[in-house]
């Protein structure tokens, strides 16, 4: 799996999970989240060469098509596969509120 | 939706469905499929600018992050959303066999 266990341990130009820390205030302009101040969002990036972690039949076909037609622009792309929520604390006036924001953290990637 | 109805009607540089016909023999080197000779596989391509058809909370956050941090390389990518199967006819010896290959045709795209 193209997850932290594999990608953070290996120098990998191909599609892999990349570390990305987002500071809510500095990077998003969000002042409304009290805790955490930021989080490890991560992202997916890298080349999708022939059959590298192909996700669907279509992406495998596309991968093969590109090998035979190298001038083609129709190549798979490195995107998130597994995502996890992030629990945040914010205030509605003076009242603290805990909320789970879905699909905020990328855990693994795929070529799609 | 970034589907044929929208994308094939509009000239769109951003993430959209693109037409792609794949000839099994010529483009994939597959001689084993008897019918059809090829099919409209389509593919997804184009830029994913600020919140263009963002798929998940993470891709929206990433989109906002890129707007505020334009030097960042952590941008969403244009990939397939809805896929459909393709029915094929092939032969096992002299015996015709009909098979449905899942996820062979891209019907719409998203920024993920």
């Amino acid at each position: 799996a193209l997850d932290a266990a594999y990608c953070f341990r290996n120098v990998q130009d191909n599609c892999c999970l990349r570390p990305l820390y987002i500071d809510f205030k500095r990077d998003l302009g969000w002042k409304w989240i009290h805790e955490p101040k930021g989080y490890n969002a991560n992202f997916c990036a890298g080349a999708c060469p022939y059959l590298w972690s192909s996700d669907t039949q279509h992406s495998r076909v596309l991968s093969l098509y590109n090998t035979i037609n190298p001038e083609a622009s129709a190549s798979p792309c490195c995107v998130s596969q597994d995502l996890e929520p992030l629990t945040i604390l914010y205030y509605i006036g003076k009242t603290p509120k805990i909320e789970q924001l879905s699909n905020m953290i990328v855990k693994s990637c795929k070529c799609s | 939706a970034l589907d044929a109805a929208y994308c094939f009607r509009n000239v769109q540089d951003n993430c959209c469905l693109r037409p792609l016909y794949i000839d099994f023999k010529r483009d994939l080197g597959w001689k084993w499929i008897h019918e059809p000779k090829g099919y409209n596989a389509n593919f997804c391509a184009g830029a994913c600018p600020y919140l263009w058809s963002s798929d998940t909370q993470h891709s929206r956050v990433l989109s906002l992050y890129n707007t505020i941090n334009p030097e960042a390389s952590a941008s969403p990518c244009c990939v397939s959303q809805d896929l459909e199967p393709l029915t094929i006819l092939y032969y096992i010896g002299k015996t015709p066999k009909i098979e449905q290959l899942s996820n062979m045709i891209v019907k719409s795209c998203k920024c993920s």
Partner: antibody, heavy 120, light 107 residues
Framework: DVQLVESGGDLVKPGGSLRLTCVAS????????MHWVRQAPGKGLQWVAY????????YYADSVKGRFTISIDNSKNTLYLQMNSLKTEDTATYYC?????????????WGQGTLVTVSS | DIVLTQPPSLSVNLGQTARITCRAS???????LAWYQQKPGQAPKLVTY???SRAPGIPDRFSGTNSGITATLTISGARAEDEADYYC?????????FGQGTKLEIK
């Protein structure tokens, strides 16, 4: 320069529907919580609803809950207020406003307002 | 809901000090109140917020204080252009509420 421009106000019959639009420019739209506030003719200000961009957390005043829907198109820098089952007491000038940063906060920029008249 | 009570009107002489009060039905804390100025046919404009912060572009003759229950907007040396409706707003608790407004007349 920060600008908020509302549109969509009209004369509508009781029970009718209307959609208000607020287009923002001059700042990173998705960074600030957005509110709708209304003002009945000759009366004071009344808060209607808010939405947090990107995460789409919304909250409503009891008087409009179940009838009004606040929504946002982050990519178009646009805030909406879908108003259904309108009552005569909904007659007001509707303003969109952004907060300084927190969910409940002072509102540093307001639109010019759009007039909604509910009358038979 | 928190109720904010303001006097309906206030009249002061040109150049005098105007003090507009806003009384809350429960303690807000010092940082959860804002004041707005609204002129006829215009949108409200933020004047002060928080404990005593002035909004950008607001002249320093405007100042706000807040004890938790009673907030005061003070206009030192009132000018003709300060004639307007003034609203207090609390954001300590949901829902956000506004006072009924005070019409300030400059004589």
């Amino acid at each position: 320069d920060v600008q908020l421009v509302e549109s969509g106000g009209d004369l509508v019959k009781p029970g009718g529907s209307l959609r208000l639009t607020c287009v923002a420019s001059g700042y990173t739209f998705s960074s600030n919580v957005m509110h709708w506030v209304r003002q009945a003719p000759g009366k004071g200000l009344q808060w209607v609803a808010y939405v947090i961009p990107i995460v789409d957390i919304a909250y409503y005043a009891d008087s409009v809950k179940g009838r009004f829907t606040i929504s946002i198109d982050n990519s178009k820098n646009t805030l909406y207020l879908q108003m259904n089952s309108l009552k005569t007491e909904d007659t007001a000038t509707y303003y969109c406003a952004r907060t300084l940063g927190l969910v409940l906060d002072a509102m540093d920029y307001w639109g010019q307002g759009t007039l909604v008249t509910v009358s038979s | 809901d928190i109720v904010l009570t303001q006097p309906p009107s206030l009249s002061v002489n040109l150049g005098q000090t105007a003090r507009i009060t806003c009384r809350a039905s429960q303690s807000l804390g010092s940082s959860y109140l804002a004041w707005y100025q609204q002129k006829p046919g215009q949108a409200p404009k933020l004047v002060t917020y928080g404990a005593s912060s002035r909004a950008p572009g607001i002249p320093d003759r405007f100042s706000g204080t807040n004890s938790g229950i009673t907030a005061t907007l003070t206009i030192s040396g009132a000018r003709a252009e300060d004639e307007a409706d003034y609203y207090c707003q609390q954001y300590a608790d949901s829902p956000i509420t506004f006072g009924q407004g005070t019409k300030l007349e400059i004589k």
